[in-house]
């Protein structure tokens, strides 16, 4: 056919315009074209032509007569997409073809599951509420709002703002409670996120707050606590940052803390914890129990030759710790503790108030008077020195038979003995634990020979008790374990003295160093028990005032006492020992004076104090179970040098929960120590000990390692 | 008409490779993913993967990776799937399946039999 | 992935029984279940999409309901033209239920 002159070739009037449906929903594209003859419409996706009903009837898109697209419902899967896409609708006649300008058609989507639900929140009044939420991924990409308790929230109130997907209330109130939705919208329609609570709970706050109290002793205190909260507050006490110990405390029903009884160990902060879901408050009060002042060690009379030392022990407690100051009496002068020493003067007082005078004239001789002084009372205690020519000084008491370990039934009857010799006589008094016994017990009574008897025996009677003999001499302390149960013997067993090895004979003296005497001695009468073994015993004025165990276990009738000072005269005595217990004493040996030694230089040259450390070499005896809770460790020492300060005696548990702990140490700070008790051990455990010398920062080489095991129950006799 | 042809009956070694076609006619190829099932003499129907014509874009489930190929030649609206590394067990029927904007296989091939057989 | 467990794996009904298969999925998968009907030799064939929409061109005796994990295909009145296996398939991950084959009784 040939060219009309009215023909002209397609022009599109109408471009189709982008557009966003819904999935499943109906849409148009549209296209209108001018032309003549009458232009025909395809449409392209992507580039690729579109099938609709005039290729397959049964499609889901028609081209209308205008040279629309519609689409009778959008598809669109998870996958295939076939209807989304950018469109062009082209309009051909034979004169030419026209192209539309794209139109994108997105479909539409708003899955289900949110990507972020809301969840329960608590807050504490005052705080702000943070609700976040994630909405369904969708397209458009979904705005949100905020239902509580089904009603939409208007986020002009000043205190509420949403942003992102975030509602957050600034300064929440009881009234912001309830159940809170979140909305994810588009022109799909609208999902509800799962409903999450917002609860509003209060802080405790005290109403009332415990009050510093300053009480004394014996006296009753309460501790007032009184708060609210939503939820109720939980109030617990602690005592200086522990739990409250057990049995000493009541709490009532409105939480006060009330103590019938103060003691001195009640003193300390105690905090009211408040606690609920949303916070926790405490609040604190000291207790301080004012407690008179008491005698730990009373200073007692002593007879001391002239140029010799004498220390008048006094120690005191009390709350506050009671100020200890010492005068003669008939002398204006008082002496306090950490004076500086005044020229020319003797005296001096320790920290811990232990009158110490070097020296001794005869002028020293009188009544010394030990005063301790505090807010809650004053006491005071007088000791008289006699000062004699005589040279040899007396030796300490010496106690023939002390107390053996024992266990006896309830309702039983003990007998601890002591029987006790020295010049001037000695005077025998008992501790229980370290304190004073019998005190007003009428159940205990010390009989004429200083027999501790207790009868109608209780089950709190159990512990240690110390027979102590005391002169102007000295004192001599011997221990033993009394443990009652419900199934020991009901009475003593009294060791008749035929049970027990004769005493030996007196020792005499073989060989003497500057730090070391050798005794012999022959074993007791014929016709006696023999004995398995010795102790040597030995006695120094200026070491100490009593007799101490300077060697265990012997098995020879010869043996080297070592680790002695130098210059220092002694006095030994030997006992027997065999199953049953310990013989009375051999007599005393003359005294015997250890070599001297040329003063060393002044200054200490480290290379010799290291070097004579290191030729130490300490003997570690096996150790002896006290009590299910103290072990006796005794050494001897080879080769005692002149630059040692004492003993690290060293044991760490090797058993139960805390195996192979850290070691802990017990230092014996006088050279001359060759024994130490470790107290507090736990029950039915094995330790490993071993002993150390130490000069300053040198350290000798570790003794051997012991194994012992502590007992369950104590050991009976 | 809408509809998918495949290749015909293939016998195959062990340890060979076999390559299947899969003809669309009838609708936008481009426009629907095609995927991939099996199904061994008297057992189920194992699906076997995707591929999206669109971009060549595909996807296997664990037991097939390594082993199957999924392509297309848009030009002639034909997607292929090649399994290597044959195996007796892998004796089955293959079909193609186009998936619809509904989430479904609404259109299959007719079924492709694959022997391996030494 | 998701597996699918369909029960009964074959039944024997009469022509005019309402059959039921059920079908479960080891986690939620809302309502992306589709069902199939296969004949011997055949390929097989779409019946039921998104859980419960009829494809065009099926009869109205097939239905499908369920959601979340479980799900059900039921055929109100058996015609012979039923006699077939049926599989279920999760549209997420795509994977097929074992299959159900009904028989004549």
């Known amino acids: 056919s040939r060219l009309r002159q009215e023909d002209f070739p397609p022009r599109i009037v109408e471009h189709p315009s982008d557009v966003i449906v819904s999935k499943g929903e109906p849409t148009t594209l549209n296209c209108k074209a001018e032309g003549r003859p009458t232009p025909t419409i395809e449409w392209y996706k992507d580039g690729e032509r579109v099938e609709t009903d005039k290729d397959d009837p049964r499609s889901h898109r028609m081209l209308l007569p205008s040279g629309s697209l519609f689409f009778l419902r959008i598809v669109h899967g998870r996958r295939s997409k076939p209807d989304e896409g950018s469109y062009v609708c082209v309009a051909r006649n034979y004169l030419g073809e026209a192209v539309s300008r794209n139109a994108s058609l997105e479909v539409a989507l708003l899955r289900d599951d949110f990507r972020q639900n809301p969840t329960d929140v608590v807050v504490a009044a005052g705080e702000p509420a943070i609700l976040e939420c994630q909405p369904p991924r969708g397209h458009p990409e979904p705005t949100i709002y905020w239902k509580k308790d089904k009603v939409r929230i208007d986020d002009k109130e000043e205190r509420i703002s949403i942003r992102g997907g975030k509602l957050m209330i600034s300064n929440t109130r009881k009234s912001d409670a309830g159940m809170y939705t979140c909305v994810g919208t588009n022109m799909v329609g609208e999902r509800d996120s799962d409903p999450a609570e917002l609860t509003v709970f209060e802080r405790p706050t005290f109403l009332r707050r415990p009050i510093n109290q300053v009480v004394l002793e014996e006296e009753a205190v309460e501790f007032r606590c009184q708060v609210q909260g939503d939820p109720q507050p939980t109030v617990r006490w602690k005592k200086d940052d522990a739990d409250l110990p057990r049995g000493r405390y009541d709490i009532k029903d409105d939480y006060t803390l009330r103590i019938k009884k103060t003691m001195s160990t009640d003193e300390g902060t105690y905090m009211c914890i408040a606690e609920n879901r949303v916070g926790k408050m405490e609040a604190s009060a000291t207790l301080t129990v004012r407690a008179p002042p008491q005698f730990v060690v009373r200073p007692r009379d002593q007879i001391v030759a002239q140029g010799r030392t004498v220390t008048f022990p006094c120690e005191t407690k009390g709350n506050p710790q009671p100020a200890v100051f010492w005068q003669k009496e008939g002398s204006q002068n008082l002496l306090f503790p950490n004076q500086p020493q005044q020229p020319n003067s003797r005296c001096s007082v320790s920290p811990t108030g232990d009158l110490t005078i070097t020296n001794i004239q005869r002028s020293d001789a009188g009544y010394y008077i030990c005063q301790a002084l505090t807010v809650a009372g004053s006491i005071l205690a007088k000791a008289q020195l006699e000062v004699t020519d005589v040279l040899t000084d007396r030796p300490p008491p010496i106690i023939l038979q002390g107390p053996a370990n024992q266990t006896l039934a309830v309702d039983g009857t003990a007998l601890l003995k002591c029987k006790a010799t020295g010049d001037p006589l000695p005077v025998i008094s008992w501790l229980k634990e370290g304190f004073t016994f019998p005190g007003r017990d009428p159940r205990a009574t010390i009989q004429e020979q200083g027999t501790l008897q207790i009868k109608n025996l209780r089950i709190s009677d159990t512990g240690t008790y110390t027979c102590v003999a005391t002169s102007s001499s000295g004192e001599t302390s011997w221990s033993a374990v009394l443990d009652v149960t419900e199934s020991g013997a009901t009475i003593s067993k009294n060791y008749d003295l035929s049970d027990l090895p004769g005493p030996p004979s007196k020792p005499q003296v073989t060989d003497v160093t500057k730090n070391s005497v050798t005794l012999s001695w022959q074993p007791g009468t014929p016709g006696t028990l023999p004995a398995s073994a010795y102790i040597i015993e030995a006695f120094s004025q200026s070491v100490s005032n009593s007799w101490q165990t300077v060697a265990n276990h012997v098995k020879t009738t010869l043996y080297t006492v070592r680790g002695l000072r130098p210059n220092t005269i002694y006095l030994f005595m030997v006992r027997a020992i065999n199953p049953q217990g310990l013989s009375d004493p051999s007599p005393m040996s003359d005294p015997v004076r250890t070599q001297d030694i040329s003063p060393p230089a002044q200054g200490v040259d480290h290379r010799q104090v290291q070097k004579e450390l290191g030729d130490v070499l300490v003997r570690l005896h096996n150790p002896v179970v006290l009590t299910p809770t103290t072990v006796q460790v005794t050494w001897t020492v080879d080769r005692q040098p002149q630059f040692i300060q004492g003993y690290r005696v060293m044991y760490r548990q090797t058993s139960g929960l805390q195996a192979t702990s850290s070691w802990q140490n017990l230092d014996a700070k006088v050279p001359t120590e060759r024994s130490a008790v470790l107290v507090n051990l736990k029950k039915g455990v094995t330790y490993e000990i071993k002993v150390r010398p130490y000069f300053n920062e040198f350290q000798g080489m570790d003794s051997e390692s012991k194994t012992v095991r502590t007992t369950e129950e104590a050991p009976s006799a | 008409e809408v509809q998918l042809v495949q290749s015909g009956a293939e016998v195959k070694k062990p340890g060979a490779s076999v390559k299947v076609s899969c003809k669309a006619s009838?609708?936008?190829?481009?426009?629907?993913?095609m995927h991939w099932v099996r199904q061994a003499p008297g057992q189920g129907l194992e699906w076997m993967g995707w591929?999206?014509?669109?971009?060549?874009?595909?996807e296997f489930p664990q037991k097939f990776q390594g082993r199957v190929t999924m392509t297309r030649d848009t030009s002639i609206t034909t997607a292929y799937m090649e399994l290597s590394r044959l195996r007796s067990d892998d004796t089955a029927v293959y079909y193609c399946?186009?998936?619809?904007?509904?989430?479904?296989?609404?259109?299959w091939g007719q079924g492709t039999m694959v022997t391996v057989s030494s | 992935d998701i597996q699918m467990t369909q029960s009964p794996s074959s039944l024997s009904a009469s022509v005019g029984d309402r059959v039921t298969i059920t079908c479960r999925a080891s986690?939620?998968?809302?309502?992306?279940l589709n069902w199939y009907q296969q004949k011997p030799g055949k390929a097989p064939k779409l019946l039921i999409y998104?859980?419960?929409s009829l494809q065009s061109g099926v009869p109205s005796r097939f239905s499908g309901s369920g959601s979340g994990t479980d799900f059900t295909l039921t055929i109100s009145s058996l015609q012979p033209e039923d006699f077939a296996t049926y599989y279920c398939q999760q549209s997420v991950g795509l994977f097929f239920g074992g299959g159900t084959k009904v028989e004549i009784k």
């Open positions: 998104a859980a419960s």
């Open positions: 591929i999206n014509p669109k971009n060549g874009d595909t």
């Open positions: 399946a186009r998936e619809s904007g509904d989430d479904a296989f609404d259109i």
């Open positions: 986690q939620s998968i809302s309502s992306y």
């Open positions: 009838g609708y936008t190829f481009t426009g629907y993913y």
